[in-house]
């Protein structure tokens, strides 16, 4: 197993609709054809898997139907979007990239993107 550099933004603010997007870029040392991308969340001394997708280079990123993540790939960049976020989901979101095929296997872990989620204030009652 070999190490690989992965870059991602330090901070992202989710939209009022609970959507956060960020780019995960990896320095591919070779010509990988099969790549696995995993989004992890670190909070309260625990790391949990948010979502994961395996894709063939040049093809679309496909997450499971019930996943809160969507994404697209372009070269060595993956554009990730996480939906349905609430204030309690604020945390450090880490991009993990694995070059699965062909060998050798490479593993890269980003420094994490701190995603801040602010629940929208409910609209006040209106006379109109």
């Amino acid at each position: 197993c070999k190490a690989m550099h992965v870059a991602q933004p330090a901070v992202v603010l989710a939209s009022s609709r609970g959507i956060a997007s960020f780019v995960c870029e990896y320095a591919s040392p070779g010509k990988a054809t099969e790549v696995r991308v995993t989004v992890l969340r670190q909070a309260d001394s625990q790391v949990t898997e948010v979502c994961a997708a395996t894709y063939m280079m040049g093809n679309e990123l496909t997450f499971l139907d019930d996943s809160i993540c969507t994404g697209t790939s372009s070269g060595n960049q993956v554009n990730l979007t996480i939906q349905g976020l609430r204030a309690m989901d604020t945390g450090l979101y880490i991009c993990k990239v694995e070059l699965m095929y062909p060998p050798p296997y490479y593993l890269g872990i980003g420094n994490g993107t701190q995603i801040y989620v602010i629940d929208p204030e409910p609209c006040p009652d209106s006379d109109f």
Epitope: L40, S45, V47, G110
Partner: nanobody, 126 residues
Framework: EVQLVESGGGLVQPGGSLRLSCEAS????????IGWFRQAPGKEREEVSC????????NYADSVKGRFTISRDNSKNTVILQMNSLRAEDTGVYYC???????????????????WGQGTQVTVSS
């Protein structure tokens, strides 16, 4: 709240083997840096081995190199310390320790640890 629980200690003859397990209750050890320390009677506690959060890096004290092997089993939420060719000087209480580092350090062992188990006694004697 995560707690570490060691098991697998016991009495073994010189040259024998033991397999120590460090298991997390109340959480997972995924991507945690885990270390094993030991304390012999009348001696200071010393680090025996550690494994990084990714499992790619392992370190060993000179006194156990080639005899001890540390590994992760994330499916069982445990870290194993396989101890072979045990000697009398390996006797002591063995402690599992853990720390979840920043992701930039997941490929390294921790310099210090937040969490300690209660320890398991290992006695090597004929």
């Amino acid at each position: 709240e995560v707690q570490l629980v060691e098991s697998g200690g016991g009495l073994v003859q010189p040259g024998g083997s033991l397999r120590l397990s460090c298991e997390a209750s109340g959480g997972t050890l995924d991507y945690w840096s885990i270390g094993w320390f030991r304390q012999a009677p009348g001696k200071e506690r010393e680090e025996v081995s550690c494994i990084s959060g990714t499992g790619l890096r392992t370190n060993y004290a000179d006194s156990v190199k080639g005899r001890f092997t540390i590994s992760r089993d994330n499916s069982k939420n445990t870290v194993i310390l396989q101890m072979n060719s045990l000697r009398a000087e390996d006797t002591g209480v063995y402690y599992c320790t853990g720390k979840l580092l920043h992701p930039s350090l997941w490929s390294a062992c921790a310099n210090e640890y937040d969490l300690w188990g209660q320890g398991t006694q290992v006695t090597v004697s004929s």
